[in-house]
């Protein structure tokens, strides 16, 4: 029951983390002008991955896109390339990751099958939610440098009578969105793991009951005379007796527990 | 059509407040910027300060202490209230509404006022 | 604050002539985000309200006469009426729309000879 329900939480974690990186990854106001210490302008500049955009105070708002892609800096293509791929490995992860929920049954999946899709979408969704935390983390690196950059020179004079307005730019929502959105798919793909770890069979508690006959370390198989060691690895059953209880998927899935010698 | 139509007291005392309504019909308040702009007689045109379709104000930095900006959207009106008036203030004072690039693309015809005791 | 200056404060013309008026800002009313200079250009009759001519420094309001051209970036701005007729005779002002106050230049007299 915990495995399942650390399996769904991890599920639904990981859709929101994803939904919110494709949002920050869509969203226009990735860096917004600074208005602290800048003179009082009647328009406000906000930039995207995609687009950049200028509000005027009169409540006009016009959108320019970035209709180059060698013009434009190597470290923004790079948060790009980052949010994207974190986009793509997200949805992967979730596709593998519905069919893997022990919810959801689909045939006679093995619990085994199931086990190996949860840890799939599990490294998926971490990989994903750290190639969102990386691109908006490398963008604001690029603004915090840019930043002082312009402090240094916010006012470039004109033969010292004329002043330009530097515009300077601060984090915007689609950072922080983004942030919260990889952190979400990290913990999300996390609990995927830790359900798979629950999920997987247990290699540990029994693996055959061998009867040791005299000088002799053989266990003896009924229904056959393939002999072989008692704790060796057996590729087709890794589980063979466990001991305990078991589900009726469990029941189906592997060898009866009267399979020992 | 677009119209603005600004109404005022016309004469006021020296040191007394004045209220000056600007009544807009075929556009929304919500939707546009509206500015006060004053002309004294025989010179030029001086900004006084705007309420945005937002409801934020922004004054000339000379008259902030002394002006106020409102309006009430349901009634389509928008208000400039003056303080401590002086004979300086004589104007033809006008209501315009902006757009494209914070500009005023619609006038209103003004009302005159006279400071004078 | 911002300073608008106009030049020259009156200009004498014939009909058909070229004019050309300035108008000088003390900070740059150049926006890097969209590229667009917030400079706006009015005409005022005597008796009526402004009329809006020219927003953007360049882009033309609806309805004006294509002879009215405006140019410039940054600090130093032109409106050019490439062929004056009896009806331009007005003053012309230029606004600053970028950073507050949004204060006008003294204005640019156009009278005929």
């Known amino acids: 029951m915990a495995v399942t329900a650390c399996q769904g939480l991890g599920f639904v974690v990981s859709l929101i983390g994803i939904a919110g990186i494709i949002a920050a990854t869509c969203m226009d106001q990735w860096s917004t002008q600074d208005l602290y210490n800048n003179p009082v302008t009647a328009v406000f500049n906000y930039q995207g991955l995609w687009r950049s955009c200028v509000r005027e105070s009169s409540g006009f708002t016009e959108c320019r896109g970035y209709f180059t892609l060698l013009g434009l800096p190597a470290m923004l293509q790079a948060v790009r390339a980052l949010m994207i791929v974190g986009i793509v490995l997200g949805a992967i992860g979730l596709l593998v990751s519905i069919f893997a929920l022990k919810c959801i049954r689909i045939g006679s999946m093995e619990d085994s099958a199931k086990a190996n899709m949860t840890l799939t979408s599990g490294i998926m969704f971490i990989v994903s939610g750290l190639c969102a935390i990386a691109g908006v983390s490398v963008f604001a690196n690029m603004l915090v440098t840019n930043f002082w950059m312009s402090t240094a020179n916010m006012y470039t004079g004109m033969g010292g009578m004329v002043q330009t307005v530097q515009t300077r730019y601060t984090f915007g929502a689609a950072l922080f969105v983004g942030w919260v959105a990889g952190g979400l798919t990290l913990i999300g793909g996390v609990m995927m793991c830790i359900a798979c770890r629950g999920l997987a069979p247990e290699e540990t508690n029994y693996k055959a009951v061998s009867y040791h006959a005299s000088g002799h370390s053989v266990a003896y198989k009924p229904g056959g005379f393939k002999a072989s060691t008692g704790f060796g690895s057996n590729t087709k059953n890794k589980k063979i007796y466990d001991g305990g209880a078991r589900t009726e998927d469990e029941v189906q899935s592997y060898p009866s527990k009267h399979d020992y010698v | 059509q677009v119209q603005l139509k600004e109404s005022g007291p016309g004469l006021v005392a020296p040191s007394q407040s004045l209220s000056i309504t600007c009544t807009v019909s075929g556009f929304s308040l919500t939707s546009y910027g509206a500015h006060w702009v004053r002309q004294p007689p025989g010179k030029g045109l001086e900004w006084l300060g705007v309420?945005?379709?937002?409801?934020?104000?922004n004054y000339d930095s000379a008259l902030m202490s002394r002006l106020s900006i409102s309006k009430d959207r349901s009634k389509s009106q928008v208000f400039l209230k003056m303080t401590s008036l002086q004979t300086d203030d004589t104007a033809m004072y006008y209501c315009a509404r902006s757009l494209y690039g914070n500009s005023f693309d619609h006038w209103g015809q003004g009302t005159t006022l006279t400071v004078s005791s | 604050d911002i300073v608008m200056t106009q030049s020259p404060s009156s200009l004498t013309v014939t009909a058909g002539e070229k004019v050309t008026m300035s108008c000088k800002s003390s900070?740059?009313?150049?926006?890097?985000?969209?590229?667009?200079?917030?400079l706006t250009w009015y005409q005022q009759k005597p008796g009526q309200p402004p009329k809006l001519l020219i927003y953007w420094a360049s882009t033309r309001e609806s309805g004006v006469p294509d002879r009215f051209t405006g140019s410039g970036s940054g600090t130093d701005f032109t409106l050019t009426i490439s062929s004056v007729q009896a009806e331009d005779l007005a003053v012309y002002y230029c606004q600053n729309n970028y950073i507050y106050p949004l204060a006008f230049g003294a204005g640019t007299k156009l009278e005929l000879k």
């Open positions: 309420i945005w379709a937002g409801g934020s104000t």
């Open positions: 900070q740059s009313l150049f926006n890097s985000g969209n590229q667009k200079n917030y």
